[in-house]
């Protein structure tokens, strides 16, 4: 924007802020039971884990920050079934971790070609 | 729990994960216009800024991670009014920044003081 009217340092600070808000994988706290769609009589300790999920702003209001690639991270958690019939078991739980994000538009019917460099 | 059944290192990793998921102020991307409730003919560049907002997990499902203290951070942004009658103006915009968080019941009898100016 009309850079001549404002000092370069101020513009640099604004630009850095904008870069930091861009759509990208961000560390997020997710609830394991909701994530896995487990029944209410199965729960985990700890109930939440940290993974990366897409978030942030896009250059257009109509675009949505969405994942383009996902890996699955294995987290060691205690799985507890109620009523408690045995010692809580330490189980590996696979949770989706977004590794790539893109600002995507809504598509009415037909898919479109998305090229991710 | 039952630490005797599991090696200390595994329990330590699980505990560290749990600590990191706890309810606390987390850096978040917020859309300025939505935040300020501005009309569509006023917009900002960049449209989003980074601030801290309460997020994370609570020990009980009935609790919600909410802010208990708030400061207001001033961000230098371009405010643009449409139709554009002058050069976009560089303005200080005050955005709420959560400095304290607590796991609170969904409908507390004695509400916590949440400051949202």
């Amino acid at each position: 924007f009309a850079a001549t009217f404002y000092d370069i340092e101020t513009l640099k600070v604004i630009d850095e802020e904008w870069q930091r808000t861009q759509c990208s994988p961000r560390e997020t706290c997710v609830e394991v039971a909701s994530e896995l769609g487990k029944s209410t009589n199965t729960f985990f300790k700890p109930p939440c884990v940290n993974v990366f999920r897409c978030g942030g702003c896009c250059n257009e209001e109509s675009l949505i920050c969405m994942n383009t690639s996902t890996s699955y991270i294995s987290k060691q958690l205690f799985e507890i079934s109620v009523p408690l019939t045995s010692v809580p078991e330490l189980v590996p739980v696979k949770v989706a971790n977004h590794t790539g994000c893109k600002c995507l538009p809504t598509a009415p019917r037909h898919p479109y070609s998305i090229i991710r460099r | 729990f039952a630490a005797t059944f599991y090696d200390i290192e595994t329990l330590k990793v699980i505990d560290e994960e749990w600590q990191r998921t706890q309810c606390s102020p987390r850096e978040t991307c917020v859309e300025v216009a939505s935040e300020l409730g501005k009309s569509t003919n006023t917009f900002f560049k960049p449209p989003c800024v980074n601030v801290f907002r309460c997020g994370g997990c609570c020990n009980e499902e009935s609790l919600i991670c909410m802010n208990t203290s708030t400061s207001y951070i001033s961000k230098q942004l371009f405010e643009i009014s449409v139709p554009l009658t002058s050069v976009p103006e560089l303005v200080p915009v005050k955005v709420a920044n959560h400095t304290g968080c607590k796991c609170l019941p969904t409908a507390p009898r004695h509400p916590y003081s949440i400051i949202r100016r």
């Epitope: 257009e60 809504t106 998305i114 | -």
Partner: antibody, heavy 118, light 112 residues
């Protein structure tokens, strides 16, 4: 003020490629998506796709079936559109247009006429 | 793809008189975020297009207030309260709710 300066007119043979440039000035180049739109002589507007200059992400109109490539050079604030395997019906004025946060194509280049003839 | 249909295709108008152009989309242009990304462009002879109205009813920078936009869902209208000689050209509606972005076929505004 915002300006989009496009490269000049070109005449190409069928089967060849063309690369149109669009140099932006007067705003933060990485903060806005750049659209490419073409207009055949006496016809309406056709959207080809866009590029996000911040990260190089592109979304193309399926109609161009892998013939189009959009790129940017952030060091010179320039956007490029390359169209391959040209046919006579690709004869058109090719426009670059900046898109505002609210979705309207708010600033346009003057267009680059590409004529495909043998 | 979303088909944008404009009517009329040609509109002969007397100077100083009002004019209106209709645009209908084959599907709703209401985005999942609640906004409607329907825009109007003007293309004068020999010129690139120029943004007039964005998001249904917001006039862009430097656009005279005789231009106004309205509508919702699938039906939209551009109105010119008093046509001036400089308004001659082709008017396009465009949508940026869905991909691919699409345009109406254009309405030619001419003076009687």
């Amino acid at each position: 003020q915002v300006q989009l300066v496009q490269s000049g007119a070109e005449v190409k043979q069928p089967g060849a490629s063309v690369k149109v440039s669009c140099k932006a000035s007067g705003y933060t180049f990485t903060g806005y998506n750049m659209y490419w739109v073409r207009q055949a002589p006496g016809q309406g507007l056709e959207w080809m796709g866009y590029i996000d200059p911040y990260n190089g992400d592109t979304t193309y109109n399926q109609r161009f079936k892998g013939r189009v490539t959009m790129t940017t050079d952030t060091s010179t604030s320039t956007a490029y559109m390359k169209l391959r395997s040209l046919r006579s019906d690709d004869t058109a004025v090719y426009y670059c247009a900046r898109t505002s946060y609210y979705g309207g194509m708010d600033y346009w280049g003057r267009g680059a006429l590409v004529t495909v003839a043998s | 793809d979303i088909v944008m249909t404009q009517t009329p295709l040609s509109s002969p108008v007397t100077l100083g008189q009002p004019a209106s152009i209709s645009c209908r989309s084959s599907q709703s242009l209401v985005h999942s975020n609640g906004n409607t990304y329907l825009h109007w462009l003007q293309q004068r002879p020999g010129q690139p297009p120029r943004l007039l109205i964005y998001k249904v009813s917001n006039r862009f920078s430097g656009v005279p207030d005789r231009f106004s936009g309205s509508g919702a869902g699938t039906d939209f209208t551009l109105r010119i309260s008093r046509v001036e000689a400089e308004d001659v050209g082709v008017y396009y509606c465009s949508q940026s709710t869905h991909v691919p972005r699409t345009f109406g076929q254009g309405t030619k505004l001419e003076i009687k």
